[in-house]
């Protein structure tokens, strides 16, 4: 299970229309459910329940976002509509270029994601926990535009790759 180096860039717009960027680095793990490769995209926070196919909305079809999913305690959802792996697949089907799971409240999900699949996803499925997960969720909860860049080797300094 290789380390995933995740850089999150938060874009704050000023009244003049300029952007100030704030970069945060954190680490996670590439799971066997997906590919060990780099990915980048706008962060979209998704609730695990939102990855069920309950309603009749058509999908948005845009490609290239990074899904951030905070998994719930298993007892909150004793009969989940999909396994964690199934939810990762659903996100990729909906256009995610990568999925990051916060497994802090559901550590058993790590084993589910690492069981290995005959048909792993062709996009990275990363999990984070502990202080890294807190850092990530603090950024995501700001409800501002943010992008994530996932790499399988430490990022070069200075960080120059984000281009609006």
């Amino acid at each position: 299970k290789e380390t995933a180096f995740v850089e999150v860039v938060l874009f704050e717009s000023s009244p003049s229309g300029d952007y100030t960027t704030y970069t945060t680095g954190l680490t996670g793990r590439f799971s066997r459910a997906g590919a060990t490769l780099s990915a980048e995209g706008e962060i979209v926070q998704m609730h695990p329940l939102g990855l069920c196919n309950n309603n009749d909305e058509e999908d948005l079809y845009e490609y290239g976002w990074v899904g951030v999913v905070k998994l719930e305690q298993p007892e909150l959802d004793p009969k989940p509509c999909l396994t964690v792996l199934g939810k990762a697949k659903r996100a990729v089907q909906r256009g995610a270029t990568a999925v990051i799971f916060d497994v802090s409240e559901n550590p058993e999900a790590i084993d589910q994601l690492n069981q290995g699949s005959e048909d792993p996803l062709k996009r990275p499925v990363v999990y984070v926990k502990g202080a890294d997960a807190i850092k990530l969720m603090n950024i995501v909860n700001k409800q501002k535009v943010a992008r994530a860049r996932i790499q399988h080797r430490p990022p070069r300094q200075p960080t120059e790759y984000f281009d609006m």
Epitope: H47, L49, E62
Partner: antibody
Framework: QVQLVQSGAEVKKPGASVKVSCKAS????????MHWVRQAPGQGLEWMGW????????KSAQKFQGRVTMTRDTSTSTVYMELSSLRSEDTAVYYC????????????WGQGTLVTVSS | DIQMTQSPSSLSASVGDRVTITCRAS??????LAWYQQKPGKAPKLLIY???TVESGVPSRFSGSGSGTDFTLTISSLQPEDFATYYC?????????FGQGTKLEIK
Amino acid sequence: QVQLVQSGAEVKKPGASVKVSCKASGYTFTSYYMHWVRQAPGQGLEWMGWINPNTGGTKSAQKFQGRVTMTRDTSTSTVYMELSSLRSEDTAVYYCARVLRGSLGFDYWGQGTLVTVSS
Amino acid sequence: DIQMTQSPSSLSASVGDRVTITCRASQDISRYLAWYQQKPGKAPKLLIYAASTVESGVPSRFSGSGSGTDFTLTISSLQPEDFATYYCQQSYRSPYTFGQGTKLEIK
């Protein structure tokens, strides 16, 4: 940072049409559905329908089918809701609301547009 | 259509009280339930979604529970700013129906 700004109040005669706009900012416009909800004076909330800003696809409550038209302009990040054949019972505050991914709730709302239908 | 029934329709309580509002769906909606707070002349504000997930920025005194057809919104210790009307809403299937509202007033 996310903002939904709606057009101003309107007074219309029965049988006329009204078009309410909702301009979005602070997020990627095409990445979230927009819904319309109305509230008659002193009454509860009533869902009208949604538009997918990415494709322009729409769905409306059966009650409004044939009378409501939802459109969007991606160049200005604006959605529109037009209600035709107005009657007095259409007097209400009309809200646009962005929905969370997976349709779990409306996390941002416009300030509301009061439409008064009176002869 | 799925009917949503809230109870009570109105409720008088005092600052510091623990308050519970219930919402019942006419059929199983899993956990596709949201709660909103609305003050006069203002747009509704999302408090809770997916039955129990507290929206970012909402005080921790608000909590939600339930699954299937029966749901609860609890305010653990009422604050003066909590006096408002509360609505539940299902998003399991369109049309996305709301409860009729619960008006929370100062005793």
